[in-house]
Interface confidence: medium
């Protein structure tokens, strides 16, 4: 599923050809139906202010690589979503790079700040992973690891709209070291603060840190799953949590290996390999159908690690919702 979005080729990071990331590969978006509402959501996701235009992606150099795929045929946002991933999308079926979508957001001068509050994750793969930097008096500063905690990371991830914080031992690699002044250390967050600037900290600019102590944070969308409608937590219709919304999973390609991963993830033992009839006794779901064509090897620890179509892409009805029965 798309895990990142960026604008490429513009003079600043808030304008350019739209590219999305899927399985580590960046691809473009076809401009079918692409309009100012879609750009508004994209600008919001990137922290680039209001939408100012829907220029063609073809305008921006260098052009998309020939081997680079067009990943999305069309995007349809209402304009209120926080991310493109929350908008209705169609998988690509017929689009060339001459039809790549572009976007332009307002205020390039302040476009290097992903959110108004002035915090960003720099030099990472996308805006939800990277070195923590905070803006103070129009200057970006790095944050020292001394006193940093997962609670502080939670605040940053929430502030950036990037989901939950991931516990990571990753340090800033040499080429990602900061070159800016070191802002502060001894961050003391409870985890409930709205912004990192709300957390108590040591004095501004007064520390003995160096840049190999810069803080690295990684966030990811919350992912969870559950079985509903059964007699216990280990049987029922499968629902997955994505972007804060529960939705069902289509049974196309679903089989024993997929069952096993779900049971394993839930700590529910092994799959009882229910019959088609048994699977149908939990009834159809309502709302979003999040996943389709899920393919697991059986070795995965989480359904999230299995291959599947883009989130929200499917050709299913709720009559095809997957149900799973585990040994408990």
């Amino acid at each position: 599923s798309p895990s990142g979005v960026r604008l490429v080729g513009g003079l600043h990071r808030c304008e350019g050809r739209v590219e999305v990331e899927q399985k580590g590969q960046w691809g473009t978006v076809c401009d079918d139906g692409w309009d100012i509402k879609d750009v508004a959501v994209l600008c919001r996701e990137l922290g680039c202010g209001a939408a100012s235009g829907t220029p063609s992606g073809i305008l921006y150099e260098p052009p998309a690589e020939k081997e680079q795929k067009v990943l999305i045929q069309s995007v349809s946002c209402t304009g209120t979503e926080d991310t493109l991933a929350q908008c209705e999308q169609e998988e690509v079926y017929d689009c060339s790079h001459d039809e790549d979508a572009g976007a332009s957001c307002e205020n390039p001068e302040s476009s290097f700040s992903p959110v108004p509050e002035g915090v960003r994750l720099a030099d990472g793969p996308g805006h939800c992973k990277g070195r923590v930097e905070v803006k103070h008096q129009n200057q970006w500063y790095t944050v020292c690891q001394t006193g940093w905690s997962l609670r502080a990371a939670k605040v940053v991830c929430r502030q950036l709209g990037c989901g939950r914080a991931v516990l990571t031992q990753k340090r800033c690699n040499k080429h990602a070291y900061g070159r800016k002044p070191i802002w502060l250390s001894q961050m003391s967050c409870s985890g409930r603060e709205a912004t990192l600037q709300d957390c108590p900290s040591g004095p501004w600019g007064k520390n003995t840190c160096n840049h190999d102590e810069d803080t690295w944070v990684e966030c990811e969308d919350p992912f969870d799953l559950r079985l509903v409608g059964g007699d216990n937590l280990c049987s029922g219709r499968l629902e997955v949590l994505h972007k804060g919304v529960w939705g069902s999973v289509c049974d196309d390609n679903w089989g024993e290996k997929e069952d096993q991963v779900v049971c394993k993830q839930l700590g529910c033992g092994k799959s009882l390999s229910p019959s088609f009839r048994d699977r149908k006794c939990y009834g159809p779901g309502v709302g979003r159908i999040w996943l389709d064509n899920v393919r697991c090897s059986g070795e995965e620890q989480s359904l999230e690690q299995c291959q599947h179509r883009f989130w929200g892409f499917h050709d299913c009805t709720h009559q095809e919702d997957v149900a799973v029965i585990c040994s408990g």
Epitope: L11, H12, D31, G53, P55, S56, L59, Y60, E61, E99
Partner: antibody
């Protein structure tokens, strides 16, 4: 290779007017095309461009007031509710390629006068 | 919106002289700047693009330099035919397409 603008005339404020740029010897699927205007005795003013796939970009002041469209041989500029300040010579221009670029071929321009 | 400020507004130099016109951008535009020459009653003519690349057919007496926010057009060995108004133009991005106010060059 040439560009020729037409449609310029005297229009009353609040009316609507479409200018047409007819291209000769130019494949519009290979070039970004733009419109620029020049009020009498004044400097050049960038209005907007249309990309090879029909996507348009306008100057902030021109959004909602101008619409650029094209066929295989023409590029149109539609003006809605013009005011006397829109009185100018309107030039059609060809970009140097598919991307944002300078304009390396210009039409002679067509004069639009907005007056009651 | 980007603003391009051209100086001077007018300059007068004798035949054989040199004219220097400056163009300052309100934000960095890399090398995405062009220079045009316009004579009365005619459309503009592209002289230089990408800040310093001479358009085909333009005499080498015209040269451009600069990048970022500061750009210069230099006309050396001035000829009578160089009398015209010169404009700079930035041309990259939705909010960065603009023309400078123009510089009138008078050849004495």
């Amino acid at each position: 290779q040439s560009l020729e603008e037409s449609g310029g005339r005297l229009v009353t404020p609040g009316g609507s007017l479409t200018l047409t740029c007819t291209v000769s010897g130019i494949d519009l699927s290979s070039y970004t095309m733009g419109w620029v205007r020049q009020a009498p005795g004044k400097g050049l003013e960038w209005i907007g461009v249309i990309a090879i796939n029909g996507g348009t970009v306008y100057a902030s002041w021109a959004k909602g007031r101008f619409t650029i469209s094209k066929t295989s041989t023409t590029v149109d500029l539609k003006m809605t509710s013009p005011t006397p300040e829109d009185t100018a010579t309107y030039f059609c221009a060809r970009g140097a390629g598919k991307t944002w670029s300078s304009f390396n071929l210009w039409g002679q321009g067509t004069l639009v006068t907005i007056s009651s | 919106e980007l603003v391009l400020t051209q100086t001077p507004a007018s300059v007068s130099e004798p035949v054989g002289g040199t004219v220097t016109i400056k163009c300052q951008a309100s934000q960095s535009i890399g090398s995405n700047l062009a220079w045009y020459q316009q004579k009365p009653g005619q459309p503009p003519k592209l002289l230089i693009y990408r800040a310093s690349t001479l358009e085909s057919g333009v005499p080498s007496r015209f040269s451009g330099s600069g990048s970022g926010t500061e750009f210069t057009l230099t006309i050396s060995d001035l000829e009578c035919a160089d009398a015209a108004t010169y404009y700079c133009q930035s041309y990259y991005g939705s909010s960065t397409n603009a023309f400078g106010g123009g510089t009138e060059v008078v050849v004495k």
